[in-house]
């Protein structure tokens, strides 16, 4: 029950996180005009990953897309790439985790398969969250670096006169959305990985029959080799040599703390 809850919660948290990453990537307010020294301004500038916008005091806003690839800063391209990779990984992770959910039955899918899928989706969520956090952090670092190196915004005034406005940019709302969303996706991924440990069966239970030897009765236990390698259930030093013949089902197996991760 706890495993199902952990897995379900991990899925929901990751879903919210990925929705947030998508929202942050699409938002225009990655950097906003710093109004600290000039709180009353005729225009308010803000920029996103895909376009830059100007809002007038009337409320009228005009946005312009960055219709170039080669002319854009390499850092901006890197941030775009990180966010897109984060979204893609997160989306695949969500798809995988839907099928991995313990509460959803798909044919005769074994718990081991669900455990593997849960682990896969968990890792994908972790990487997705890290990509988003990295992308937002790179952009934030870029803003901090350029804060004092004011950006010149060109506006053509009336009669062909050119007016240059010195503008400094600070953190926009999208950065905070991205950080929180990345964190949520990361937490969701960790929860999925934790749930995977509880989902993974200790070993496959075969209906094996033990055979009597002429001398000492030796019960053949499938997975005996695994026990000797340290990955099976013999980590608790259970006897695998028994006097009487019995089926494997009669041999009580205890859950091990050494499950698949």
């Amino acid at each position: 029950m706890a495993v199902t809850a952990c897995q379900g919660l991990g899925f929901v948290v990751s879903l919210i996180g990925i929705a947030g990453i998508i929202a942050a990537t699409c938002m225009d307010q990655w950097s906003t005009q710093d109004l600290y020294n000039n709180p009353v301004t005729a225009v308010f500038n803000y920029q996103g990953l895909w376009r830059s916008c100007v809002r007038e005091s009337s409320g009228f806003t005009e946005c312009r897309g960055y219709f170039t690839l080669l002319g854009l800063p390499a850092m901006l391209q890197a941030v775009r790439a990180l966010m897109i990779v984060g979204i893609v990984l997160g989306a695949i992770g969500l798809l995988v985790s839907i099928f991995a959910l313990k509460c959803i039955r798909i044919g005769s899918m074994e718990d081991s398969a669900k455990a593997n899928m849960t682990l896969t989706s968990g890792i994908m969520f972790i990487v997705s969250g890290l990509c988003a956090i990295a992308g937002v952090s790179v952009f934030a670092n870029m803003l901090v670096t350029n804060f004092w190196m004011s950006t010149a915004n060109m506006y053509t005034g009336m009669g062909g006169m050119v007016q240059t406005v010195q503008t400094r940019y600070t953190f926009g709302a999208a950065l905070f959305v991205g950080w929180v969303a990345g964190g949520l996706t990361l937490i969701g991924g960790v929860m999925m990985c934790i749930a995977c440990r509880g989902l993974a069966p200790e070993e496959t239970n075969y209906k094996a029959v033990s055979y009597h030897a002429s001398g000492h009765s030796v019960a053949y236990k499938p997975g005996g080799f695994k026990a000797s390698t340290g990955f099976g259930s013999n980590t608790k030093n259970k006897k695998i040599y028994d006097g009487g013949a019995r089926t494997e089902d009669e041999v009580q197996s205890y859950p091990s703390k050494h499950d698949y991760v």
Partner: nanobody
């Protein structure tokens, strides 16, 4: 140089309607209307992007005014309904070559007076 020709202003009673027209001598990126009430500053009323038809209206006129365009005539129209006394102003047609922002408006009309009074 683009010439803007405005028409349609006049005296109207409160609650009445007027239709302002503005024709440009050649195509522009954006066209719109600004107004200046007596003793007040210039206020953006509405604008339309000629290429895709996207429109913007000031909150004070939303639901009462509509802006439309006719690309074949390089013209823009402002339909004003339910006019109020506070709508009294000189209405200026404006056009931008590459932007609709006030600072980037390249061309201005002479203005047409709209008076709302009983």
């Amino acid at each position: 140089e683009v010439q803007l020709l405005e028409s349609g202003g006049g005296l109207v009673q409160p609650g009445g309607s007027l239709r302002l027209s503005c024709a440009a001598s050649r195509s522009t990126y954006c066209m719109g209307w600004f107004r200046q009430a007596p003793g007040k500053g210039l206020e953006r009323v509405a604008n339309v992007y000629m290429r895709n038809g996207d429109t913007w209206l000031a909150d004070s006129v939303k639901g009462r005014f509509t802006i439309s365009r006719d690309n074949s005539k390089n013209a823009v129209y402002l339909q004003m309904n339910s006019l109020r006394a506070e709508d009294t102003a000189v209405y200026y047609c404006a056009a931008g070559r590459s932007s609709c922002l006030e600072a980037s408006i390249s061309y201005w009309g002479q203005g047409t007076l709209v008076t709302v009074s009983s």
